[in-house]
């Protein structure tokens, strides 16, 4: 009888442990729809605009924006500006991240540009000094762009 | 316009080794990707990889590893097919082609492999 | 490896015909998918890119639709100059695999 009261005090007394754990963490990450939510509410047209920027130069195909309005370093720190509205959470960004590839993904043309815009991508944050994504998946739209 | 042109047709013992060039003009040759597809007498168009001309990275189709090397010069606009070890089965026409808005293909290049 | 099949193989039609072809992959790849049309002795030539876009100088009466795994591409009024062979080619990034192309011969 003891040892069952034992065995039961144990086993709350992991769960307690575990479930704090698990709160720790999830504040630390940055609780999943709050991320969503924030994502929503900041304009991520400057990251975006930013990010094709250096891909496209000053390529003529790329005219969904007049990209060659504003210059490159005003549009990275205008994106910087927009994500320091989030909470800086390696889950917020990564979210924030995937919301940019899902957005220009059909402004993308080919496999190449898919390639060097995630790269530019997954440079974003170190480059407002952000905490960056350890994994951020970025094949979006089914897995294909 | 965008314009691929690719080398004269080549006729190889087995065994010999060939490469082949596909020249770009009309636009910057860094910014899209560069594929290579093969279509042996009579069949369909085979793909067999991909280069990315900003890195120079090669991507290839199963089937297309070891023999077969895919490489650039930047400086003349031109990308290259090198196939060693020539076997029958590689007479072919060789393809360049461009991916993305304006996508085109070059003229062709053929391959024969005969003793 | 992503596999692409295409049908009908052969499509006997008219000239003013409405023509479909069908192009389905074996999983999701977006709107990655092209096509091209070449006739016997030439290169092939792009027609669509990005399931949709038609290609410059490309008659407006070719259309591309679908997204996912399912493909079409529709010509309304079939011309004397649009019988060839016809292939549908996913372009994703790791792969490029062409469906094995459909014929389309005279009636």
């Known amino acids: 009888m003891a040892k069952s009261t034992i065995l039961v005090a144990l086993l709350a007394l992991v769960l307690v442990a575990h479930a704090s754990a698990m709160r720790r963490e999830r504040g630390r990450q940055g609780d999943s729809s709050s991320c969503e939510r924030q994502v929503d509410r900041v304009n991520l047209k400057p990251c975006e605009q930013h990010i094709m920027q250096r891909i496209m130069g000053e390529q003529e195909q790329y005219d969904s924006y007049d990209i060659r309005s504003t210059r490159s370093s005003d549009q990275q720190q205008r994106c910087c500006d927009e994500l320091n509205e989030m909470e800086n959470t390696q889950r917020c960004m990564c979210e924030a991240l995937q919301q940019i590839m899902e957005n220009q993904c059909d402004r993308l043309q080919d496999r190449q540009m898919v390639q060097q815009f995630k790269r530019e991508l997954m440079n974003l944050p170190q480059q407002c000094n952000f905490r960056a994504p350890q994994r951020c998946d970025l094949d979006v739209s089914g897995g294909r762009c | 316009q965008v314009q691929l042109v690719q080398s004269e047709s080549e006729l190889k013992k087995p065994g010999a080794s060939v490469k082949i060039s596909c020249k770009a003009s009309g636009y910057d040759l860094t910014k899209y990707a560069m594929n290579w597809v093969r279509q042996a007498p009579g069949q369909g168009l085979e793909w067999m990889g991909w280069i990315n001309t900003n890195t120079a990275k090669p991507t290839y189709a199963q089937g297309f590893t070891g023999r077969f090397v895919f490489s650039l010069d930047t400086s003349v606009r031109t990308i290259y097919l090198e196939i060693s070890n020539l076997k029958a089965e590689d007479t072919a026409i060789y393809y360049c082609s461009r991916d993305g808005s304006g996508a085109s293909w070059g003229q062709g290049t053929l391959v024969t492999v005969s003793s | 490896d992503i596999q692409m099949t295409q049908s009908p193989s052969t499509l006997s039609a008219s000239v003013g015909d409405r023509v479909t072809i069908t192009c389905r992959a074996s999983q999701n790849i977006g709107r990655w998918l092209a096509w091209h049309q070449q006739k016997p002795g030439k290169a092939p030539k792009v027609l669509i890119t990005?399931?949709?876009n038609l290609e410059s100088g490309v008659p407006s009466r070719f259309t591309g639709s679908g997204s996912g795994t399912d493909f079409t591409l529709t010509i309304t009024s079939l011309q004397p100059d649009d019988f060839a062979t016809y292939y549908c080619?996913?372009?994703?990034?790791?792969?490029?695999?062409f469906g094995q192309g459909t014929r389309v011969e005279i009636k």
């Open positions: 990005k399931a949709s």
């Open positions: 080619q996913q372009y994703t990034t790791y792969s490029g695999t």
